[in-house]
């Protein structure tokens, strides 16, 4: 009777994550008697998979019924495939032995490639914020994936970017691969709808890439440009002075009035409008009573937006150019809660 | 280390029964198949049947059936033999002796034996 | 009920020298045999399996050859220790059937 061979007859399996893995093997003779055992990895280091006799393998089932007499299938199945479990798997014939039974013949090896897809990809953007014309860096991370080649691209409102860099780790052979990616953004004006897009393209996800995004509104900073403007005399002794400010992002936004250097009201944006391209626009007014003045007054509109250095825009209102009210009227006339009254 | 343990010798009359005992220990009880062999003073081996604990199957030879019962104790790893309606021919040595399956009947672990007397 | 012939029943050699039991079995057993050495008082312990597969720990001068119906045990080289009853036995199909025994002594 010629010797017993064990055939492996896959010299490659490749399996998704979470699937299950059927590796096949099967011997020539039911001689010696023995039992099969499986191992990951050959040499001293090798991982028991399965043993027919001790144990217990609770992922293992075995393709055909071992203790039959005439089975010579030893093929097992795992269960739950991670690609903690790729490597090259040995069906071992042993026979029969004390204290420990004895190495008869392995089969030549089945390498178990498992699949493994990317995590959906994160990206990050700069911790504080920026405003246009600068350029800000973006990163993009997906862990997890097998095998290692991976396709990853960048896209702002559609547009692919070209200006970036990207890492898959580790470089050698691994059970699985991260891969980190870092673009650069030069902002604009109107980037405060805009998007900035990871999209990473890999095997197991069958065409279908899987993106991340991050808005820029939540990195860009539209500083507000300002205007003082002198509105048409409301009453004789009345001028109303506005101060625009436009075409700013965030909305958090702190005005100050000043007469002649002194504060003279606080206030926070609060109904702002809201402009096509995602700013605000916010105005603020003071009725101003210049029969109190005898001099000119220097009005300054301070505002301080999204915690920056605060920037201001003067307006000089010449109190000569109006007649003075008879009467002592002093008291502000506060039609509305911008109205101020010059004392 | 495997170790197959029986239980004491037994005298019994003509008609008896016995029930003979053999626990095991130093390996897994239910992956390994129990048989048991007698051996009468001057005779020849004599193989009277198998018991595989995994599965509660066993079989017997055609010439003990119907007076040899083989049963096992998981909980216990243990394995008996019961021999019915004795005479005195049956007077031997019994051995349980573990093999690898149920289609192997090689012996690769004895116990010591229990020698069962029938004599009036 | 496979039977298993065992010759001869008992032999005398001297230390060193080469001894050969055989045992024929009566319908094929393909290599399914079993060779076992029992020394007086003690139990029966398994020397050859599957014809020629010697069982850990046993002397390298003991060897087992055979398919079919005819198989051997031979002792290339007999020691004092090797003072037993050897037995055959197929393992082909139940019921399990051994050779009648070969008692071995010393000159």
């Known amino acids: 009777e010629e010797e017993l061979q064990v055939i492996q007859p896959d010299k490659s399996v490749l399996v998704a994550a979470g699937e299950t893995a059927t590796l096949r093997c099967t011997a020539t003779s039911l001689i010696p008697v023995g039992p099969i055992q499986w191992f990951r990895g050959a040499g001293p280091g090798r991982e028991l998979i399965y043993n027919q006799k001790e144990g217990h393998f609770p992922r293992v089932t075995t393709v055909s019924d071992l203790t039959k007499r005439n089975n010579m299938d030893f093929s097992i199945r795992i269960g739950n495939i991670t690609p903690a479990d790729a490597g090259t798997y040995y069906c071992v014939k042993f026979r029969k032995g004390s204290p420990d039974d004895v190495e008869f013949k392995s089969g030549a090896g089945t390498e178990l490639s498992v699949r493994a897809k990317p995590s959906a990809p994160v990206v990050s953007g700069p911790a504080a914020r920026a405003t246009p014309q600068h350029t800000v860096s973006f990163t993009c991370e997906s862990h997890g994936f097998s095998p290692r080649d991976i396709t990853l691209k960048w896209f702002k409102n559609g547009n692919e970017l070209s200006d970036f860099q990207t890492n898959v780790d580790p470089v050698g052979e691994s059970v699985s691969y991260s891969i980190h990616s870092t673009a650069k953004v030069v902002l604009t004006r109107e980037d405060v709808h805009s998007q900035v897009i990871c999209e990473v393209a890999h095997v197991t996800l069958q065409g279908d890439p899987l993106r991340g995004t991050a808005n820029l509104s939540e990195t860009i900073r539209v500083p507000p440009t300002l205007e003082v403007t002198q509105q048409p005399v409301r009453a004789e002794n009345q001028v109303n002075v506005t101060c625009q400010v436009r075409k700013f992002y965030p909305q958090r936004l702190q005005l100050t009035w000043l007469e002649n250097g002194n504060v003279s009201r606080t206030e926070t944006a609060s109904t702002v409008t809201e402009n096509k391209d995602g700013t605000y626009n916010w105005m603020s007014w003071l009725l101003v009573n210049v029969s109190a003045h005898r001099d000119d007054v220097k009005l300054t509109c301070q505002v301080e937006h999204d915690g920056q250095p605060a920037v201001s825009k003067s307006h000089d209102l010449k109190v000569s150019a109006h007649p003075k009210e008879q009467g002592s009227n002093t008291a502000a006339e506060n039609t509305g809660s911008n109205e101020r009254n010059i004392y | 280390q495997v170790q197959l343990v029986q239980s004491g010798a037994e005298v019994k009359k003509p008609g008896a029964s016995v029930k003979v005992s053999c626990k095991a220990s130093?390996?897994?009880?239910?992956?390994?198949?129990m048989h048991w062999v007698r051996q009468a003073p001057g005779q020849r081996l004599e193989w009277m049947g198998y018991?595989?604990?995994?599965?509660?199957?066993?079989k017997y030879n055609e010439k003990f059936k119907g007076r040899v019962t083989i049963t096992r104790d998981t909980s216990a790893s243990t394995a008996y033999m019961e021999l019915s309606s004795l005479r005195s021919e049956d007077t031997a040595v019994y051995y349980c002796?573990?093999?690898?399956?149920?289609?192997?009947?090689?012996?690769?672990?004895w116990g010591q034996g229990t020698t069962v007397t029938v004599s009036s | 009920d496979i039977q298993m012939t065992q010759s001869p029943s008992s032999l005398s050699a001297s230390v060193g020298d080469r001894v050969t039991i055989t045992c024929k079995a009566s319908?094929?057993?393909?290599?399914?045999v079993a060779w076992y050495q029992q020394k007086p008082g003690k139990v029966p312990k398994l020397l050859i399996y599957?014809?020629?597969y010697r069982y850990t720990g046993v002397p390298s001068r003991f060897s087992g050859s055979g398919s079919g119906t005819d198989f051997t045990l031979t002792i290339s080289s007999l020691q004092p220790e090797d003072v037993a009853t050897y037995y055959c036995?197929?393992?082909?199909?139940?019921?399990?059937?051994f050779g009648g025994g070969t008692k071995v002594e010393i000159k």
């Open positions: 002796a573990r093999s690898y399956y149920d289609y192997d009947g090689s012996f690769d672990y």
């Open positions: 130093g390996y897994t009880f239910t992956s390994y198949v």
């Open positions: 018991i595989n604990p995994y599965n509660d199957g066993t």
């Open positions: 319908q094929d057993v393909t290599t399914a």
């Open positions: 599957s014809a020629s």
């Open positions: 036995q197929q393992h082909y199909s139940t019921p399990w059937t």
